[in-house]
Amino acid sequence: VLEVYYTSLRCRCVQESSVFIPRRFIDRIQILPRGNGCPRKEIIVWKKNKSIVCVDPQAEWIQRMMEVLRKRSSSTLPVPVFKRKIP
C-alpha cells in the first residue's frame, strides 16, 4: 500500500510507484511542484475507488496524463504586454 503523509520534510509521498493505472480508474491527478520544504515534484493520483497513489513523475504513462492537464491549463492565448514609451 502506498501512503501519503505529511512528513517532516513536508513531502506528502513516502513511496512512489511507476505501475500503470488505467485512465478509467483515475478520478483526478494532483501535481505538487517542488518547494514548500519538499525537494522533489510529487504526483498524487486519486482513484475512483477513493484510494490515493503517489506516482513516479518520470513514469512514461503519467507524462501523457499530465500533458492533458497542461494542454488544458495553457489554452488561453497569452496577451501581449505593450510597454508605453514615456516621453
Partner: antibody
Framework: QVTLKESGPGILQPSQTLSLTCSFS??????????VGWIRQPSGKGLEWLAH???????YYNPALKSRLTISKDTSKNQVFLKIANVDTADTATYYC???????????WGQGTTLTVSS | DVLMTQTPLSLPVSLGTQASISCRSS???????????LQWYLQKPGQSPQLLIY???NRFSGVPDRFSGSGSGTDFTLKISRVEAEDLGVYYC?????????FGGGTKLEIK
Amino acid sequence: QVTLKESGPGILQPSQTLSLTCSFSEFSLSVFGMGVGWIRQPSGKGLEWLAHIWWDDEKYYNPALKSRLTISKDTSKNQVFLKIANVDTADTATYYCARIDGYYDFDYWGQGTTLTVSS
Amino acid sequence: DVLMTQTPLSLPVSLGTQASISCRSSHSIVQDNGNTYLQWYLQKPGQSPQLLIYKVSNRFSGVPDRFSGSGSGTDFTLKISRVEAEDLGVYYCFQGSYVPYTFGGGTKLEIK
C-alpha cells in the same frame, strides 16, 4: 469501434433555440482525459469550432458565440448536448460532434446533422 | 484569436506526384508547456473530416505513411508523397493550442 451520431430538428425559424444531441459509443466521458466537442460547417464553407466539454465537466466555448451556447453531458447515457439560443439564418450549417482523447483533438467525428434556419 | 491561413486554396495534382499544403498561424501556437497542437484533417466529398496528423508531425492510427507533417512556431506543412485517388478532398489545418480553437480555410486537392 468509436462512433458518434448527431441529432437535431432539421429546420428552425429565426429566434428559436437549437437543441442538438450527440450520442456516442465505445468510449466514456467518465474516463480521465476524454472530451466531446461541437464543430459546424455551412454548406460549401469551412469548419468552425463551437464548444467542447471534458470528462470533469470543464467547458470551453467559442467567445464569438459564447452568450448563445450551452454545452452539457449525460455521462451515464453517453450523450453530449449543445443548445444555441436565438438562431438566425447565419446558423444554417451541418453540425458535427467529435471526440477529444487527451491531446488528440477531434479524432473521431459523427456524420453530421443539417440545420436550416428559415422563416 | 489565432487565424490559420492555408495556401493554396486549390491544388491540382497528377496521381503519383507529391503535393504540399502550407498553413500559417497569426500567432505562435507553441504552448508554454512546449507542445504545439497543430493537426491536419481531410474531408472527402460528402464525408466528415478525418484526422491525419496530430501535434505537427505524428500520423494518426491507420494513416498511410505517404502523409507527413512538419513545421514549428507559425509555419506548418502537410506533404503527400505520392497522391492517390482516395486522397482527393479538402484538407484543413487546425490549432488546438489556444481557445478559440481555429481551422484553416481549407485546401482542395483535385486531379489535374
